[in-house]
């Protein structure tokens, strides 16, 4: 190999080992048979050599700077060429430095052909290897502006009194070309301006200079977008870190086309803007950092750009501003990520504050729109809070657990609604009584309605979930102890035309000691299938349920146990059940934890099932599963 | 055997125009970097010019910038300096040298030199 | 540019005797191969000039060994073990690190 440079070139090159392999021979840079590993040389001198291993590649890299000085003469502005050649250069890694230096006063453009630009964050790579580094100066500091891969949206980067440009090329990419060129602009009066160009459709991540790092103190950073008036953009903060400012406030500012209110203050922590047409410029500004203690300023964001949706001129309004302890939240339902450009789906508050998710809350009226090319990548949660703090003013009264209709007019599924309904402990207790009776979820015979309430225990240390319940069966009313949640849960959008179907009233009502009581009604001629609580999990220690099962005067009632034994193992205490007849009082007792099971039973009256818990022992749980028949008297049942 | 022969000097006025030529053998002469070094009568050696193997580079002492171009042919295996606007110091012997292909520049192959003379 | 400088101007020898040659140069030619990007030319009266020694201390192919270079940075010297009659001329020294090439003045050996 010879490299010869050219004498006012002002080019360095050097070539030294790169990052040390597990190689066991050692490699050589070899001249005039002295064998080295470092070779440096300057403009005007040549360098004849060669390399005493057949793969330099995986031992050395080469390192070409160009020093460009402004301050002395005429900048050398226009294309940046490759110098010397990539074609005259030994196949190593090889990086390409330009380090411009110029007055303060004047501006620096790099100007990026296509492909343009990405940025990438710490730790991240560029596919084909080829990176660019750039950097800025502040006197004497060097300020990081970022590292980026082809392919982006970045088509120009602006900067003042001097920058720093290293583009690094794998030893096998055939690039021979720099791809961007230099021009000089007025002064930019701050660090740097980053412009960012949208053809169409696509996103773009960006990060504050000197990102992970602190950005510098008391700098003013700019990005300008370029969007097609056609389209619209919208920002979202990935992270950022705000520092200890004595004087001044970090934020950041919007000059959004048509804004009557420019420059537009945001704070990092605010929801910041979306859904914005055309071409836009974002401003991060620091401040003057506490000197003892300044903490670190950074931003990483992303901008996203996507065709405005036919939702997104309309604004619905939801108005909670009678509605007490209740917040909805819209927000991504999970999916599986895919690897191609998805566009975003953003819920706005007053058409412009747009984000991925956003919670609305209880006392006022509040106007949202959409920035989505399909709704029903979206949908609603929401939580209300029912609770009774003196019991002398709650007892007997009645709530209506019901989806308020502002609610449901809205073009995103509802997910959740949850109710959490609190009651002053040992005081009171609650019971619920559904519209339309309610049937419990099981595998015998799963719920296919459109909606389902789950009922929980709502105290913290409580693991108890009662079931899934559905209109549409015998279980007439649902009586627990203490505080508990009431979850809707819709499962397929005909819920919208469904939802006259639900309507569930829940009253405070005088302390019981059992964990839960349900009320079945069985209608002729359909099994009526019930559970214990906490199904698969077996139901807590020492707790205890019972079931009210009325039988009507003309029917008779079949009780079928699903198991020959409970399979319940008690570390303390006896886990039992009770079947009683309520008209004579007549009971039989079960040892869960030793008898066999009843076989079925026929009860001409209603009756109670009720089952106690012990402490089990772990893995050997209690779950049971009965069914109820009614079958007319008149029928030989023997 | 390496040979170097000059050949074009003559006597010329100032401001005048001249065409050296370098005609090379023995060796791969487009394998070279060559070069022009100069020496006024009883002074010392100069170097003038130098040009890489393919023609792409080319190297000048300041005094001569602008006013002379080095080329190459390497087809004919030829090496040319063109002289314009020539003033009385560019009188000198013109040598042709070729450049050791080894690092640095150093020549190992001088030709016997052709005289310039600048005068009026 | 690099500058070179030569002493002495002219040295008068002896045959049989040694002789040397210094040349000083204004910036160091010591590369980052630890080569010395130095080179000493001999042009004998009427002749062209020919190498005598590279990169500071290598002698060109049939160069006797009489002749010898040594130094480094920038001072460098050339000295002949035994002058012989066929040594006489003039001797320069030339910096061969970067364009442009820059010689010293030269010293004449002449037979006292």
């Known amino acids: 190999f010879e490299i010869a440079l050219p004498r006012e070139s002002n080019i360095t090159v050097l070539i030294k080992l790169g990052t040390p392999t597990l190689l066991a021979k050692p490699c050589y840079i070899v001249i005039s048979k002295r064998h080295i590993t470092m070779l440096s040389i300057k403009s005007g001198e040549r360098i004849v050599f060669t390399f005493s291993c057949q793969s330099p590649e995986n031992h050395f890299v080469i390192e070409i700077q160009k020093n460009i000085d402004c301050m002395s003469g005429p900048c050398p502005f226009g294309e940046v060429q490759l110098q010397p050649s990539t074609s005259l250069l030994p196949t190593l890694n090889r990086t390409f430095i330009w380090d411009v230096k110029a007055h303060k006063s004047i501006g620096l453009e790099l100007q990026f052909s296509i492909p343009r630009l990405r940025q990438i964050g710490p730790g991240e790579s560029c596919p084909d290897g080829v990176t660019h580094s750039i950097s800025g100066r502040i006197d004497a500091t060097v300020v990081r502006i970022g590292t980026f891969c082809s392919n982006g949206t970045v088509s120009r980067i602006k900067m003042q009194e001097g920058v720093k440009m290293a583009l690094h090329l794998p030893w096998f990419h055939p690039r021979n070309v720099s791809g961007f060129s230099i021009a000089n602009r007025s002064s930019i009066k701050r660090l740097c301006i980053i412009e960012s160009v949208f053809e169409g459709e696509g996103s773009a991540t960006l990060m504050s200079a000197n990102y992970p790092e602190g950005f510098p103190e008391d700098e003013l950073m700019t990005w300008q977008f370029v969007v097609p008036a056609h389209l619209r953009a919208s920002v979202s903060f990935l992270n950022f870190n705000l520092s200890n400012c004595e004087r001044k406030e970090e934020r950041v500012e919007y000059y959004i086309p048509g804004s009557t209110t420019n420059p537009e203050v945001f704070k990092l922590e605010d929801k910041q803007p979306g859904n914005m047409a055309g071409n836009f410029n974002l401003s991060l500004q620091g401040c003057d950092q506490d000197a003892q203690s300044p903490g670190i300023l950074r931003l990483q964001f992303q901008v996203l750009v996507q065709h405005p949706q036919n939702e997104s001129n309309k604004i619905y309004v939801v108005d909670l501003s009678n509605e007490r302890a209740m917040s909805l939240t819209i927000e991504p339902r999970p999916v599986k990520q895919s690897r191609k450009f998805v566009p975003g789906c953003f819920v706005c508050l007053e058409s412009r504050t747009c984000s991925s998710n956003l919670t609305l809350t209880s006392g006022s009226k509040h106007k949202i729109s959409f920035l989505c090319d399909d709704l029903t990548r979206l949908w609603m949660n929401v939580e209300k809070t029912i609770s009774c703090t003196d019991h002398r003013y709650c007892q007997r009264k009645s709530y209506s657990l019901q989806v308020p209709s502002d609610i449901l007019h809205l073009p995103v599924e509802l997910h959740d609604f949850s109710w959490k309904l609190l009651v002053p402990k040992d005081r009171l207790s609650l019971v619920l009584v559904p519209a339309q009776k309610l049937q419990q979820h099981t595998h015998e015979k799963p719920c296919n309605t459109s909606f389902s309430y789950l009922v929980a225990s709502a105290i913290p240390s409580q693991d108890l979930y009662f079931g899934s319940f559905c209109p549409g069966g015998s279980i007439k009313q649902i009586q627990v102890k203490q505080n508990i949640s009431v979850t809707l849960r819709t499962f397929a959008p005909s819920f919208q035309q469904e939802a006259s179907r639900q309507g569930l009233t829940v009253s405070f009502i005088p302390y019981f000691k059992e964990e839960g009581v349900f009320t079945v009604t069985p209608d002729t001629k359909s099994k009526v299938y019930l559970r214990t609580p906490n199904w698969d999990r077996g139901l807590p220690s020492l707790t205890s349920v019972s079931w009210n099962i009325s039988v009507p005067r003309d029917q008779v009632a079949c009780l079928t146990f699903f198991k020959e034994r409970s399979g319940v193992v008690c570390q303390t205490g006896r886990a039992f059940m009770i079947i009683q007849e309520q008209r004579t009082r007549a009971e039989e007792i079960f040892s869960l934890d030793e008898d066999v099971l009843p076989k079925p039973s026929f009860h001409h009256h209603s009756f109670w099932v009720n089952i106690s818990n012990c402490s089990p022992t772990s893995g050997k749980q209690l779950d049971l599963l009965f069914s109820v028949t009614l079958t007319p008297r008149t029928v030989d049942l023997t | 055997e390496v040979q170097l022969v000059e050949s074009g000097g003559g006597l010329v006025q100032p401001g005048g125009s001249l065409r050296l030529s370098c005609a090379a053998s023995?060796?791969?002469?487009?394998?070279?970097?060559m070069s022009w070094v100069r020496q006024a009568p009883g002074k010392g050696l100069e170097w003038v010019a130098n040009?890489?193997?393919?023609?792409?580079?080319?190297d000048y002492v300041d005094s001569v910038k602008g006013r002379f171009t080095i080329s190459r042919d390497n087809a004919k295996n030829s090496l040319y300096l063109q002289m314009n606007s020539l003033r009385a110091e560019d009188t000198a012997v013109y040598y042709c040298?070729?450049?050791?292909?080894?690092?640095?520049?150093?020549?190992?192959?001088w030709g016997q030199g052709t005289l310039v003379t600048v005068s009026s | 540019d690099i500058v070179m400088t030569q002493s002495p101007l002219s040295l008068p020898v002896t045959p049989g005797e040694p002789a040397s040659i210094s040349c000083r140069s204004s910036?160091?030619?010591?590369?980052?191969?630890?080569?010395?990007?130095l080179d000493w030319y001999l042009q004998k009266p009427g002749q062209s000039p020919q190498l005598l020694i590279f990169?500071?201390?290598n002698r060109a192919s049939g160069v006797p060994d009489r002749f010898s270079g040594s130094g480094s940075g920038t001072d460098f010297t050339l000295k002949i073990s035994r002058v012989e009659a066929e040594d006489v001329g003039i001797y320069y020294c030339?910096?061969?690190?970067?364009?442009?090439?820059?010689f010293g003045g030269g010293t004449k050996v002449e037979i006292k």
């Open positions: 030339m910096q061969a690190l970067q364009t442009p090439l820059t």
């Open positions: 040009v890489k193997q393919d023609g792409s580079e080319k």
């Open positions: 023995g060796f791969t002469f487009s394998s070279y970097w």
């Open positions: 040298a070729r450049e050791w292909n080894s690092s640095g520049w150093t020549f190992d192959y």
């Open positions: 910036q160091s030619l010591l590369h980052s191969t630890g080569y010395n990007f």
């Open positions: 990169l500071g201390s």
